[in-house]
Interface confidence: low
Amino acid sequence: SQVSQNCHNGSYEISVLMMGNSAFAEPLKNLEDAVNEGLEIVRGRLQNAGLNVTVNATFMYSDGLIHNSGDCRSSTCEGLDLLRKISNAQRMGCVLIGPSCTYSTFQMYLDTELSYPMISAGSFGLSCDYKETLTRLMSPARKLMYFLVNFWKTNDLPFKTYSWSTSYVYKNGTETEDCFWYLNALEASVSYFSHELGFKVVLRQDKEFQDILMDHNRKSNVIIMCGGPEFLYKLKGDRAVAEDIVIILVDLFNDQYFEDNVTAPDYMKNVLVLTLSPGNSLLNSSFSRNLSPTKRDFALAYLNGILLFGHMLKIFLENGENITTPKFAHAFRNLTFEGYDGPVTLDDWGDVDSTMVLLYTSVDTKKYKVLLTYDTHVNKTYPVDMSPTFTWKNSKLPNDITGRGPQ
């Protein structure tokens, strides 16, 4: 039901849901630090703009008694319980930051009259697409799907001369929250990815995956999986792999490939890694010292959520417009704002756009090298290395179906 908002008379509050069930196992203290760092920046920006207002955050913690799995499985009710808590206390801010779990976001969106914007660090699933007052600051599954279809169809690059129309997807149910929804989207029979592919089979057992690597009767040479190199090694080990197998490892929120002196292990030679172009300024900021590279994106999304709110607040205040209106709630999309480490672009549906990067392992240097980049905003691929030192024959990616000639 409708809750009055603490959002007027020069005082603007942000409600931050601190849920025990989270897309990433990040200590809530680190997220608090990220939010507080964001608040400092917002206050400075508003002051510089001559806007003498107060901006604060209220952290809403759940009791954690019932919903304590720690992952997203029991997040649906936790989100609604927190909303009830806000409602009872009449403590709703101008904007709601969190939740990060797809289940809880979907349910909260359904069960509330959203006259306020909701900003999420996560909510990766397709069920959270196209929500009018929801903004997602980490790449959702739809963006991954569009890249994969674009890449599958590409056939005019020196290193990729075949269109692909087939794939295996490895999904064993132990994935992290982001991977779970990414693979879920690829598995869904009604998704864009499934619609565009002629053949797609989900491998659910380790043995199924391992058998495909050398199976002469396999229906596709391409296997998509999600996780880090260690996850792949646990599954693949040092097993022999047919020379025309291509493993696409989706590992978006992992900066380790870009660190100096990183050498790619031998088992990565048949692998293309899809990750995000790294940020730059989190390396030595106060709140990120305790974060692993894989957690930076999550904390950064919270921080950027605060900066996004500050950006919109500034625009509305400068235009003399009311904050507690549907117009404000629907405004958090189709824009670029100054994020913590550079411009952040949101698409027409409030989802973050980014530069995805496809890496390969150079057989010469054993380093990860950039094969191409992909701009999710314009759905366009930019080739980077025109003569890659691949493990594959003739330094070209193989056809997706063995024995099929040029198309």
Partner: nanobody
């Protein structure tokens, strides 16, 4: 090899503005960042501003707040809007394209004009900007 052609230079009074353009042709697929550099008479070439493929801009401290770098990917053109020009901005301005396939190049820190190593960079011929009353 990428062919870069700068234009828009000229003589301008202090405090006025100028906009430089740089048209790129040839293969630009390995571009990870483009930028503007300048070389004043008797001085070393220095970074002014850079912009990554995804649009992240960085500036040398001496031009921050006065200069704006932008790009139009559809026209393959780079721009430098120079406002509040000063006498010390007098120099030959070069457009540059940084090309490398190493993953580490995508780190925007390594694309900052102050930190940019000049290996793997294609240069234009330069356009002269003179700020004088």
């Amino acid at each position: 090899q990428v062919h870069l052609v700068e234009s828009g230079g000229g003589v301008v009074q202090p405090g006025r503005s100028l906009r430089l353009s740089c048209a790129a042709s040839g293969y630009t697929g390995r571009r990870l960042c483009r930028g503007w550099f300048r070389q004043a008479p008797g001085k070393e070439r220095e970074g002014v501003a850079t912009i990554t493929l995804s649009g992240r801009a960085s500036y040398a401290d001496s031009v921050k707040g006065r200069f704006t770098i932008s790009q139009d990917n559809s026209k393959n053109t780079l721009y430098l809007q120079m406002n509040s020009l000063r006498a010390e901005d007098t120099a030959v301005y070069f457009c540059a394209e940084v090309r490398s396939a190493d993953a580490e190049w995508l780190n925007p820190l390594k694309c900052h004009p102050d930190r940019l190593g000049l290996a793997g960079v294609d240069w234009g011929q330069g356009t002269t900007v003179t700020v004088s009353s």
